[in-house]
């Protein structure tokens, strides 16, 4: 498989058959698949060097792995997008052997002197062809030469099979399956041959191709493949319930932010709640996690403005649940990204020198910001798309807080909507879905560059639009939701999570 190890070295060779038998639409589809693959790999913070070859009678090398920009995913994607099927129109035979020889030439080194680290570089060839080579001879001989060059299968104690993967995608109206199978790698419990119909569900294909065992701790990563569970798609999501004898129980959500901490809303708990009465589950697992302590933001005080006629005051409504035992990350349990951390800088593919302010400008610009939250409906987790009103609609969004029960007598809305809040909901630019009571404490998320970054914690809503946890279809335009802006509670997060190796900026 393609081992996505951010500390490893990898060359990926994209080889695309542009011969007569492929056809323009299949060529375009294959290109799209490769663009998606480049993006998927880049989302892991891995920067492989790319080689890009198209071929028919002759190969054409568009990107060499030795080029300075070959590890710049955006630049490689641009080169790929600029390739036309017509480029090979005049010489449209199929010489797959020559194309693979072009790959071999990129792999080999001058004067037979291998560069430092050659033996630690993994090589991945992704060949998109119909397998109908009609000139140049059998391409399998070049695969053998490549294996020889990379010293694969020659050393009994160190076969190095994981240093070469050859994936073949069968594209075109007629595919020679025998030829395609012959070229692809053969490894136990791995799939290296894919058909056209597989390309309709690329996430399923990538799931077969990618080994992410070296990058399970990456924040904000998800798998969207069809066989995935809700927690493959939202692996950070935590379910919290507080059992209060004779008072029933409170349900909330939270987000895994590190191996020991879940971030949630402070209002989910009271000072009387004991640790043993708080149940937290992650990854869709039945068992509950043991709680060491719940850490409230020191400025949170729900009764802080009672004397001013404000029954409930949600400023600084954030809490961290510290777990007794370290979480074991996997595909259904992994952290979400937090603002102003090194992990988020890498997730957004920003320069290492990026400041907290620059992250804020990237994630929360002064405009309507597309975001999402995760809600449970009929035992299923679903993503709800909302817009954070952070531009010209911010004021009107915040003013609608006056319609909240108990806030109708508030003279100045800034008494309840402090600078700590982000506002969503309403009908412009789109009708936003609203949060339900059980969504409290869950993350408000910005999805960028295939990664998920938490910008807020769901706190309170103006209208209870969820009778019996069922969202009503018709809701008033003033149905707004308020979320604690994580950029505003960073000093506290940084202090409490200082041992979690998150690299706060």
């Amino acid at each position: 498989k393609i081992v996505l190890d951010p500390s490893g070295s990898m060359n990926i060779y994209l080889v695309l058959d542009g011969s007569d038998s492929i056809g323009a639409s299949n060529f375009t589809g294959a290109k799209k698949c490769l663009v998606n693959l480049i993006e998927k790999v880049a989302s892991y913070g891995v920067k492989p060097r790319y080689g890009l070859v198209t071929y028919a009678t002759y190969p054409k090398i568009w990107v060499k792995v030795s080029e300075a920009d070959s590890s710049n995913a955006d630049w490689v994607t641009k080169q790929l997008n600029e390739i036309n099927y017509e480029d090979h129109k005049l010489k449209s035979g199929t010489n797959t052997k020559k194309a693979l020889q072009a790959v071999y030439s990129m792999m080999s080194w001058p004067d037979d002197v291998p560069p430092e680290g050659w033996n630690r570089t993994r090589h991945v060839i992704i060949l998109m062809t119909d397998g109908l080579h009609n000139m140049g001879g059998d391409p399998i001989t070049v695969i053998d030469e490549i294996r020889d060059l990379l010293y694969i299968g020659k050393d009994r104690k160190n076969p190095r099979e994981d240093y070469l993967d050859v994936y073949v995608f069968g594209v075109g109206p007629l595919v020679n399956q025998v030829n395609i199978n012959a070229l692809a790698s053969k490894k136990d419990n791995e799939q290296h041959v894919f058909k056209v119909k597989d390309m309709e569900n690329l996430e399923d294909v990538f799931y077969q191709m990618i080994d992410e065992s070296q990058s399970l701790s990456l924040c904000g990563m998800v798998w969207e493949h069809r066989k995935g569970t809700d927690y493959h798609k939202q692996p950070w999501q935590a379910k919290i319930s507080v059992i209060r004898p004779s008072k029933g129980h409170e349900s909330c959500m939270g987000a895994v932010v590190s191996e020991y901490f879940v971030l949630t809303a402070a209002h989910c708990f009271t000072v009387d709640d004991k640790e043993h009465s708080i149940k937290v589950s992650v990854g869709g697992e039945k068992r509950d996690l043991e709680i060491e302590v719940v850490l409230f933001h020191p400025n949170y005080n729900i009764n802080g403005k009672k004397e001013a006629g404000i029954p409930e005051f949600y400023d600084y409504d954030v809490a961290l649940i510290k777990l007794k035992n370290k979480l074991k990350y996997g595909q259904t349990i992994r952290p979400i990204c937090l603002p102003c951390t090194e992990g988020t800088t890498r997730a957004l593919r920003l320069p290492p020198t990026t400041t907290c302010q620059q992250q804020k400008e990237e994630l929360l610009p002064a405009q309507d910001i597309k975001a999402l939250f995760v809600s449970e409906e009929e035992k299923k987790l679903t993503r709800k798309e909302v817009y954070i009103k952070n531009g010209d609609k911010k004021g009107s969004c915040e003013r609608d807080a006056q319609y909240a029960p108990g806030y109708d007598k508030v003279k100045d809305i800034s008494e309840v909507v402090t600078p700590r809040f982000l506002c969503t909901g309403g009908v412009s630019p789109y009708a936003d879905p609203n949060t339900c009571r059980g969504d409290s404490g869950g993350p408000l998320i910005v999805h960028k560059r295939s990664r998920f970054i938490q910008v807020g914690v769901i706190s309170w809503g103006v209208v209870d639009v969820c009778k019996n946890q069922k969202r009503q279809k018709q809701v008033p335009a003033h149905a707004r939701d308020f979320h604690i802006n994580l950029f505003q509670v960073l000093p506290w997060l940084k202090e409490k999570l200082q041992d979690e190796d998150l690299g706060f900026l």
Partner: antibody
Framework: EVQLVESGGGLVQPGGSLRLSCGTT????????MSWVRQAPGKGLEWLGF??????????EYAASVKGRFTISRDNSKNTLYLQMNSLKTEDTAVYYC????????????WGQGTLVTVSS | EIVLTQSPATLSLSPGERATLSCKAS??????????MNWYQQKPGQAPRLLIY???NLESGIPARFSGSGSGTDFTLTISSLEPEDGATYYC?????????FGQGTKLEIK
């Protein structure tokens, strides 16, 4: 056809130095471990060390009995293996063989004919 | 280092007889499902010749009367029906752990 030919043996005084060479033909030299083995008169075989193949950067490994005194090196452009022997002792008197160590199964599948080194005053 | 002990030190048998040579290792020479034990034949004045690799695999060009068996620490070289030319010294050698080591050898005499 695989061939290994040792050279450089002879008479040397205790404390002296000698460099043995092993020229090879018939195979891709850099892809193989290459070993030195010796046999004292009337005694058994003693492995002295090897030079690993290209994946391991041709790094050497030595038997404890010669570590620090003997050095194994290779010139891949000449397909030749070397054994530099310093501070020689009378007990180093032996026939010295070079052998191709096949990483496909970690066995010495081809041997040279040997070269005799005599350490004596 | 791994010490290899061969027995018997010498063996005297007639042509057509079966020869069984033993080699015991001070610790296992197995790695990842393979036994890294090799057998060599050496005749006087000649270089050693590989007979068996990885405990039981016959090197090409070696007569089928030679066979190897064993795993872990106990290994056997068997010559099913001795020929006059089999008179030689036989060495076992392990290549599982560095440094490589040889047994002290078994001298086989043909009567």
């Amino acid at each position: 056809e695989v061939q290994l030919v040792e050279s450089g043996g002879g008479l040397v005084q205790p404390g002296g130095s000698l460099r043995l060479s092993c020229g090879t033909t018939g195979f891709t030299f850099r892809d193989y471990y290459m070993s030195w083995v010796r046999q004292a008169p009337g005694k058994g075989l003693e492995w002295l060390g090897f030079s690993r193949h290209r994946v391991y950067g041709y790094t050497p490994e030595y038997a404890a009995s010669v570590k620090g005194r003997f050095t194994i090196s290779r010139d891949n452009s000449k397909n030749t293996l070397y054994l530099q022997m310093n501070s020689l002792k009378t007990e180093d008197t032996a026939v010295y063989y070079c052998a191709r160590d096949n990483p496909g199964y970690y066995a010495m599948d081809y041997w040279g004919q040997g070269t005799l080194v005599t350490v004596s005053s | 280092e791994i010490v290899l002990t061969q027995s018997p030190a010498t063996l005297s048998l007639s042509p057509g007889e079966r020869a069984t040579l033993s080699c015991k290792a001070s610790q296992s020479v197995d790695y990842d499902g393979d036994s890294y034990m090799n057998w060599y034949q050496q005749k006087p004045g000649q270089a050693p010749r590989l007979l068996i690799y990885a405990a039981s695999n016959l090197e090409s060009g070696i007569p089928a009367r030679f066979s190897g068996s064993g795993s872990g620490t106990d290994f056997t070289l068997t010559i099913s029906s001795l020929e006059p030319e089999d008179g030689a010294t036989y060495y076992c050698q392990q290549s599982n752990a560095d440094p490589y080591t040889f047994g002290q050898g078994t001298k086989l005499e043909i009567k």
